[in-house]
Amino acid sequence: EVEKTACPSGKKAREIDESLIFYKKWELEACVDAALLATQMDRVNAIPFTYEQLDVLKHKLDELYPQGYPESVIQHLGYLFLKMSPEDIRKWNVTSLETLKALLEVNKGHEMSPQVATLIDRFVKGRGQLDKDTLDTLTAFYPGYLCSLSPEELSSVPPSSIWAVRPQDLDTCDPRQLDVLYPKARLAFQNMNGSEYFVKIQSFLGGAPTEDLKALSQQNVSMDLATFMKLRTDAVLPLTVAEVQKLLGPHVEGLKAEERHRPVRDWILRQRQDDLDTLGLGLQGGIPNGYLVLDLSMQEALS
């Protein structure tokens, strides 16, 4: 707590200006009116205050707004935002995307802090869903944002927002997240023609089921190996050699380099060696000729 002392004669701040960096902490406390500070928050960012001075300014705002700051103040917090705790932020009601952008700008270039995570959470909950503009903004600042959400949280993303997602935004997503996002992407891009559709859906294919992969194999899409390696193993296993060949097109040669890695390894184990040989890649490990393949999962289902 800063001691309550009288403001020295002639030092009462008439405006928030650059002279305040020369005030001691107790002078700021005594000479800066909290209401003046609140109305001139936009000036604070232009003035190189010390961290200790920022603490005093925050304290003044906390006293003025014990229930949480109004958005008119929040929007102009600037680097004072870095002084806020998640507990402070939970008191806020942030509804404007401009306010969100202004605060994310302050943290730009840094990892997502607990403050930022709380701010985003408050904002998204206030909106009820992750709309396209919000998603656009969040992924612009934090490309990995989408993949930081749980499958449950992702379920609130409307298909229309998927248009804002860039391939790099999905780099760190796991299969569970892609399982949720893929159907939304399929719906969002459904009216596009074949080649354009594939370009858009490609990043989401880690959540695609077998039947969709089979359908894609009929469309000359020439999927690259990097995308193929991210497909769900359980979706790849039922594909035939012919389907994989059509799916990959000229990239099929890349299977040889990946034959020890999932899902290629597991897929090879399910194919007849005769079929694999037709690719001419020297892939080994398929089912030898004359062997009978029993689908035990089907048998269990019948019993």
Epitope: D17, I47, P48, T50
Partner: antibody, heavy 120, light 112 residues
Framework: QVQLKESGPGLVAPSQSLSITCTVS????????ISWVRQPPGKGLEWLGV???????NYNSALKSRLSISKDNSKSQVFLKMNSLQTDDTARFYC??????????????WGQGTSVTVSS | DVVMTQTPLSLPVSLGDQASISCRSS???????????LHWYLQKPGQSPKLLIY???NRFSGVPDRFSGSGSGTDFTLKISRVETEDLGVYFC?????????FGSGTKLEIK
């Protein structure tokens, strides 16, 4: 372009007061602070005081009791008033712009100065 | 108040030589915000002072790169790598970390 121009009386009698006006153009006094600096003949620079964008002031400790700086933003003018002048107050008086943003409180533009002689 | 001590008071140099001026402050010029508000000005004969270097080492617009500033805390240096005729005059260091602001006493750069 940025310009500062001082205007003063030239000659002041001992014990009288001095008033100098600094008229600026090319920028706003609501965005920049103004410092006053003086230089006795053949000597160094002495900082007198500053008026900040919000109207607050700081002064040279030794001269504080004799100095007063004010301004009129709408007229783009800054005023220096100095009381009880003595002969050793004879000097050239400069106003200079304090750029607290990009240049961090350096005085980036100066007036040409006005010469003040204290003599009876 | 912060006292700024400049050395030497006079610096005779030959054209093309390097010149070095020292400025020492009576207390640290590092502000609590991490910035060091130490500046250098040049006053040519019959002219107003002009800003050369701000915040220790940043050249003001139009200042040739033969001028460089360095230092930290309480010790600062202005260097001119190859002195030219137009560089002659009095150099002042100044601090705006603490109010009141203060100037050094000046160093006169003259031809040997």
């Amino acid at each position: 372009q940025v310009q500062l121009k001082e205007s003063g009386p030239g000659l002041v009698a001992p014990s009288q007061s001095l008033s100098i006006t600094c008229t600026v153009s090319g920028f706003s006094l609501s965005s920049y602070a103004i410092s006053w600096v003086r230089q006795p003949p053949g000597k160094g620079l002495e900082w007198l005081g500053v008026i900040w964008t919000g109207g607050g002031t700081n002064y040279n400790s030794a001269l504080k009791s004799r100095l007063s700086i004010s301004k009129d933003n709408s007229k783009s003018q800054v005023f220096l008033k100095m009381n009880s002048l003595q002969t050793d107050d004879t000097a050239r008086f400069y106003c200079a712009r304090n750029n607290y943003g990009r240049l961090d409180y350096a005085m980036d533009y100066w007036g040409q100065g006005t010469s003040v002689t204290v003599s009876s | 108040d912060v006292v700024m001590t400049q050395t030497p008071l006079s610096l005779p140099v030959s054209l093309g030589d390097q010149a070095s001026i020292s400025c020492r402050s009576s207390q640290s010029l590092v502000h609590g915000n991490g910035n060091t508000y130490l500046h250098w000005y040049l006053q040519k004969p019959g002219q107003s002072p002009k800003l050369l270097i701000y915040k220790v080492s940043n050249r003001f617009s139009g200042v040739p790169d033969r001028f460089s500033g360095s230092g930290s805390g309480t010790d600062f240096t202005l260097k001119i790598s190859r002195v030219e005729t137009e560089d002659l005059g009095v150099y002042f260091c100044s601090q705006s970390t603490h109010v009141p602001f203060t100037f050094g006493s000046g160093t006169k750069l003259e031809i040997k």
